[in-house]
């Protein structure tokens, strides 16, 4: 049975920058990939990007760059212009349409331990002074 994976990563240096990686593990060739956020197809998800192997890619804000990584995996860079990132608790979904398998969707979010709101504050770095 085909397997779909989603990886959500937050940039360590830029809390408002996220990257979503998605991949399809199975036979058949990918004919279309749709990335959404806020839920899957039919459950209130909002389209972020559509990637077609021949016709190219189309993306909508806050998506910054959608691209193919391999023939069966894609990445989507997201940039939040606001002060606090809404992405931390958001579900991102990738739907792969493949021939002859059909379409398969997987959703993922930032792991709870990566949520800046849940993690411990950073340890202050001591400032060394030479008197």
């Amino acid at each position: 049975t085909p397997e779909v994976w989603v990886q959500v990563q937050m940039e360590a240096t830029e809390l408002s920058s996220f990257t979503v990686h998605c991949g399809f593990l199975g036979p058949g060739s990918i004919s279309l990939v749709t990335v959404s956020w806020g839920g899957p197809d039919g459950a209130g998800g909002t389209k972020l990007a559509v990637l077609h192997p021949e016709l190219g890619t189309r993306q909508w804000a806050p998506a910054r760059q959608a691209r193919w990584e391999t023939q069966s995996s894609i990445s989507l860079a997201l940039e939040d212009s606001g002060a606090s990132s809404p992405f931390a608790n958001t579900t991102f979904c990738c739907k792969f349409a493949s021939f002859p398998e059909g379409s398969w969707e997987s959703c993922g979010s930032l792991p709870p331990s990566s949520d800046p709101g849940l993690s411990a504050p950073p340890t202050p770095v001591p400032i060394l002074r030479a008197d």
């Epitope: 989603v6 990563q9 398969w104 969707e105 993922g108």
Partner: nanobody
Framework: QLQLVESGGGLVQSGGSLRLSCAAS????????MGWFRQAPGKEREFVGR??????????SYADFVKGRFTLYGNQARNTVYLQMNSLKPEDTAVYYC??????????????????WGKGTLVTVSS
């Protein structure tokens, strides 16, 4: 001990949608692989799909009959797993069960080796 409680079932017309929820409580740290199964009247329980978390990556796989109509997803922080079901057919009528699965679960094993079961929620699709 892990407790699983399903909700969201009900009566829906053919072509309609439903979202089932599975809330886990108790030993939720063991929620590394979760699955959905279903049992139609007079039939054996069958695998629908499973979701597996590994670090920042979520892996999802489905039974062949799903054919893109269902999406399994979860919220680890809230210990909840969902099954979004679209384009429902009368043959989807069944009791749907949430399950906690061993990490090496093989979908071909059907319901064997499942660690914990919920009590199930009934989905009826009318034509």
């Amino acid at each position: 001990q892990l407790q699983l409680v399903e909700s969201g079932g009900g009566l829906v017309q053919s072509g309609g949608s439903l979202r089932l929820s599975c809330a886990a409580s108790g030993r939720t740290r063991s929620m590394y692989v979760m699955g959905w199964f279903r049992q139609a009247p007079g039939k054996e329980r069958e695998f629908v799909g499973r979701i597996k978390w590994s670090g920042d990556t979520t892996y999802t796989s489905y039974a062949d009959f799903v054919k893109g109509r269902f999406t399994l997803y979860g919220n680890q922080a809230r210990n909840t797993v969902y099954l979004q079901m679209n384009s429902l057919k009368p043959e989807d009528t069944a009791v749907y069960y949430c399950a906690a699965l061993p990490s090496d679960y093989d979908y071909r094993a059907a319901s064997y080796g499942v660690d914990y079961w919920g009590k199930g929620t009934l989905v009826t699709v009318s034509s």
